[in-house]
Structures are given as structure tokens and as C-alpha cells.
């Protein structure tokens, strides 16, 4: 059984204010069963960026259809980028548990930074 890896290929992503940013995340295994969430930052204070199951994320869309049973692409798009969006973003796999899901593995993170405006 292959051990799950969380792949975030870009270490740094330069984005432009007002544009849409795509944060890539793929997994190498469908197991263990459980959701993938997106966070900004690390530690107790990390901010929830996207949770497929619940929440309000008006600027976030998924690249793939997460409801498909064999989906392994958990990439997201964040629209209307502002300077307040900079930071390091992590996709994190949770293992389904009762009563609560348990964090299983985190991706290495993608730092989103503002790039120069196109001339």
C-alpha cells in the first residue's frame, strides 16, 4: 500500500492584485479516507481557506470535482487577489474519525507573494 504524499509543486507563487491565483495540490493515494482542507499559516492560529464539507468561501473554487470518488486533485483558485492574501498556504489531509477527523499529513506549503504588475 503506497504511503500518501501531499504534493504542492510550487514553493513560491507570484500573483497579481485583482487576478485569480491557482494553488496546486495533488495526493498520491485515495487512502486514508477523509477530507483535504486548505489553510493559511501554521500552528493553532492557522486560517481556514477552504473546506469542501462546510463553510463560506466566496472567493474560492476548486479546479477539479471533489465529489468524484477517485479525485486526487485538490487544487483551488482564489479570485480577486489583494495584498492581504499573501502568505503560505497548505493543503492538509485529514483521516476520517469519530467524533472528529484527525490531521494526517500536510503538504509542504506554497508561499503566495505579490509579483510586479504587468507593464
Amino acid at each position: 500500500e503506497e504511503e500518501l504524499q501531499m504534493i504542492q509543486p510550487e514553493k513560491l507563487l507570484l500573483v497579481t492584485v485583482g487576478k485569480t491565483a491557482t494553488l496546486h495540490c495533488t495526493v498520491t493515494s485515495l487512502l486514508p479516507v477523509g477530507p483535504v482542507l486548505w489553510f493559511r499559516g501554521v500552528g493553532p492560529g492557522r486560517e481556514l481557506i477552504y473546506n469542501q464539507k462546510e463553510g463560506h468561501f466566496p472567493r474560492v473554487t476548486t479546479v477539479s470535482d471533489l465529489t468524484k470518488r477517485n479525485n486526487m486533485d485538490f487544487s483551488i483558485r482564489i479570485s480577486s487577489i489583494t495584498p492581504a492574501d499573501v502568505g503560505t498556504y497548505y493543503c492538509v489531509k485529514f483521516r476520517k474519525g469519530s467524533p472528529e477527523n484527525v490531521e494526517f499529513k500536510s503538504g509542504p506549503g506554497t508561499e503566495m507573494a505579490l509579483g510586479a504588475k504587468p507593464s
Epitope: L37, F39, R40, G41, G43, P44, G45, R46, E47, L48, I49, E54, G55, H56, F57, G87, E100, N101, E103
Partner: antibody, heavy 117, light 108 residues
Framework: DVQLVESGGGLVRPGESLRLSCAAS????????VTWVRQAPGEGLEWVSL???????YYADSVKGRFTISRDNSKSTLYLQMNSLRAEDTAVYYC???????????WGLGTLVTVSS | EIVLTQSPGTLSVSPGERATFSCRAS??????LAWYQQKPGQAPRLLIY???TRATGIPARFSGSGSGTEFTLTISSLQSEDFAVYYC??????????FGGGTKVEIK
Amino acid sequence: DVQLVESGGGLVRPGESLRLSCAASGFTFTNYAVTWVRQAPGEGLEWVSLISVTGTTYYADSVKGRFTISRDNSKSTLYLQMNSLRAEDTAVYYCAKVTWKNVFDYWGLGTLVTVSS
Amino acid sequence: EIVLTQSPGTLSVSPGERATFSCRASQTVGSKLAWYQQKPGQAPRLLIYDANTRATGIPARFSGSGSGTEFTLTISSLQSEDFAVYYCQQHTDWPPYTFGGGTKVEIK
């Protein structure tokens, strides 16, 4: 505008219990960790407890086993259940929103808890 | 647990003057240090994080510097509304989140 409003403070005797509430508005409550910080009369700030977006809880050693932090995302409300209260728990209790940088960017006005016989 | 020590305990300054005070950490916190301002009867207000980044809406007269274990908050020209207590907080090693004991800036 971000608003945090604490309630539930008051005068209790040592050994008694109290539950504080903090009603949040002006931001997406479910997306942020929230925390309690207290300040004894004439003293500095002391971090008490934090609950993450996924519900993981953290406590200062001084309150571990006596205080319980919880959140109701459907009501955008943070709670602090305080049991076995001691005189040294007397303080103004503030709730605060936590940023992804692990700093506290918005604070309520606080609620005073007095523990005295 | 990281212990933060602020000095001086009280600083007497005249309006318009420069005020500088420090925060020392018991072990390195990199650049992960924040500063808060608290006026009597009010809640604390975030001023600076990451040692030198001003929080939203904070005037340019407030500046932070330092890294590792030694940090400084400077108010370039004190206004009447700046007389308050200032606390530092480390945001690299949690829990617990720790604060310094505070520096009171009073009118000279």
C-alpha cells in the same frame, strides 16, 4: 466591522463555576481561531486558552483541567467554562480573533470575573 | 516556555519626543514578535507583528525592529493618544502564547 462582545462575568465564590460567552460578528467566524486572554487588576496580559478552526483546544497550565474552551460556529460564539474558580482567576477576560500569524488582531472590551469569599 | 522581559517598566516622555523601549526573549523567536498598545479601561490593540510589520490602520510613527532575542518599539514623535501601556508577545512558539510584563509610557 469586526466586533467581539464578551458576557457572563460576575462575582462568584471560590470553588464555584461561571461560563463566559463571546459573540462575534463582522468576519467569517468558522475560518479563524479564537482565544481568551485575561488581565488581573493592575497586572499584565496572560493568555488563557485558544480553540483552532478545527476545534483543537489549547490551555495555559494555570487553567488546565479547570477551564474548557468551546465554540458554536452556527452562532458565531466562543465560550469559556470556568470551574473550580480561585481568587487568582480574578481578572478581566478578553476574547480575541487570532490571525494566521498567531497574533490577536481584534479584541472585545472584556468581562470582569471576581472570585471572592 | 519563552519568557519576555520588557524594559524600562515606565518611560516618562514629553509630547513630540521620541520614545524607544525594548523586549528581550529568553530564547530566539526569529522575527516572530508582536507589539500591543493598551490604554486605561480599554482592550489591547495590535500595533506590530513579525517584528516590524504595522497592523492595519497603525500610523507610521510606530516602528518595530530587532530579531532573535532583542526587539525595540519606537514611537518617532509622541502624540497625546500614545500615552499607554505597551506589551510585546512572541508568536513563534505556542502554546503558551506569552506576553512581556509591559512598559508604561507616561507624560513627563
